[in-house]
């Protein structure tokens, strides 16, 4: 189809080569309801189309991207840049930065229900750039917590170096749905709750005495409980001697609860206590068997092959650790009469 | 945190059919995220099979394309995957991950696949 016809945006994206961030472009095609875009050949140059996120169809899916090749090939169908590119309804998301996606993408409605829809598209000039130095050292990160239950912001991390009363106005979305009371580089939110976690991209127009283009970053927001203040808690073995019989195969499991921390590498191992001695054991992966808002049970299990003898007289450690502290159980084989 | 957790794996003959699921902690996440399997065979690195937007719109890689159908209930918080007319190069551990959104890259502790010839 001829693309000559399509409403231009020009978009920047300019990432930081330090952290793994995502960028997305919207189909921004007009409702109908409120603009006659789509028959674009009855606006007179002077009418400017309002641009928002296309609610036109019920299904969202409903729209097609295409990517223009810069040799001026023909358009390509985007799903064969997949799995690089991904569409989510009207969403296009690029899941890995670089200058290689710079280029026009361009959307339409798959079902062109009259001639005049034809006309019906958007082309988007991306134009991908990594952050340089000189940029602001301390920018918001792409991805932002917030402490549930507490006060909190949302910060735009092309922006984040800016005052509030020299930024310009900003377009905020979330999960792609567009936040028309936010205006400004910074979300305040009074209290926060679990639906407040999500995808937010902050848009704002940047121009020069040529042309004008959106910024736009991505934000990804989790909603977290506090750093827990204790170190973990052992479950299981409760018991501090066990049952054996000799010459039989036998699994001792260690299970610990770990509270959250933001920064969370939880140390659980077995050692084994002999006399004087003691020295770690290779044991088989620590899994996470349970993971709540509040706190993660991992487990790791010791696998004798066979209980001998010897193994009646050591004791068996389990080791668990956070940042706050450690914790220990230890366990006595006994055999069984 | 989001904990993802795998099943269905197993042995399955070449041409037969398995059906893997993938168990979600966290609604919120879940439903806002484009979900998906990733598998990695033996000796290789992991690749993303398929995925499945927030909206329903599915992607495969070309060579499970017309064999498998990835699927999602956001009422159960779980993820699916049809598997049919399997190889052997399908063998490998197949894990289910958030591709875009907040737990972006949590993958499960998966699930192994093998398929006999």
């Known amino acids: 189809f001829n693309i000559s016809g399509c409403s231009t945006k020009k978009l920047l994206w300019t990432y930081s080569t330090r952290s793994e961030e995502e960028f997305v472009l919207f189909c921004d095609l007009p409702e109908p309801q409120k603009s006659h875009f789509c028959h674009r050949n009855r606006l007179s140059p002077k009418q400017v189309p309002e641009h928002l996120p296309f609610m036109g169809s019920n299904d969202l899916s409903d729209v097609q991207w295409y990517q223009q090749p810069s040799n001026g090939d023909p358009l390509e169908d985007i799903r064969k840049s997949y799995p690089h590119i991904i569409q989510d309804k009207c969403t296009l998301h690029f899941l890995t930065p670089g200058v290689n996606n710079s280029g026009s993408y361009i959307c339409r409605p798959k079902m062109i229900k009259s001639p005049y829809d034809v006309a019906c598209c958007v082309k988007m000039i991306l134009e991908v750039k990594p952050q340089t130095n000189a940029s602001c050292e301390y920018s918001a990160s792409h991805k932002q917590d917030l402490l549930l239950g507490s006060t909190g912001s949302i910060s735009c991390p092309s922006l984040s170096c800016q005052s509030d009363a020299q930024s310009p106005a900003v377009t905020w979305y979330k999960n792609g749905k567009l936040l028309s009371v936010e205006r400004s580089n910074r979300i305040v939110v009074d209290e926060v709750y679990d639906y407040h976690q999500g995808t937010y991209v902050c848009d704002y127009t940047q121009s020069d005495t040529v042309s004008s283009w959106t910024v736009r970053a991505v934000v990804q927001v989790r909603t977290i409980v506090g750093d827990t203040k204790l170190k973990p808690d052992i479950l299981d073995p409760v018991e501090d001697t066990l049952e054996v019989e000799l010459g039989k195969p036998l699994t001792i499991s260690c299970k610990a609860r770990f509270g959250f921390e933001r920064v969370f590498n939880p140390v659980i191992k077995w050692y084994i206590k002999d006399s004087d001695l003691e020295w770690e054991v290779s044991v088989p992966e620590a899994k996470s068997i349970k993971s709540t808002l509040k706190d993660e049970i991992i487990e790791r299990n010791i696998i004798l092959e066979k209980v001998t003898q010897r193994d009646l007289r050591r004791k068996f450690v389990c080791f668990v650790q956070n940042s706050i502290g450690n914790t220990t159980q230890s366990v006595q084989l006994k055999e069984k009469r | 945190q989001l904990q993802l957790l795998e099943s269905g794996g197993g042995l399955v003959q070449a041409g037969g059919s398995l059906r893997l699921s993938c168990a979600a902690s966290?609604?919120?996440?879940?439903?806002?995220?484009?979900m998906g399997w990733y598998r990695q065979a033996p000796g290789k690195g992991r690749e993303l099979v398929s995925s499945?937007?927030?909206?329903?719109?599915?992607n495969y890689v070309d060579s499970v394309k017309g064999r498998f159908t990835i699927s999602r209930d956001n009422s159960k918080k779980t993820l699916y995957l049809q598997m049919n007319s399997l190889r052997a190069e399908d063998t490998a551990v197949y894990y289910c991950?958030?591709?875009?959104?907040?737990?972006?890259?949590?993958l499960g502790q998966g699930t192994l696949v093998t398929v006999s010839s």
């Open positions: 966290r609604s919120i996440t879940f439903s806002h995220n484009v």
């Open positions: 499945i937007g927030s909206g329903g719109s599915t």
């Open positions: 991950g958030v591709v875009v959104g907040v737990y972006r890259g949590s």
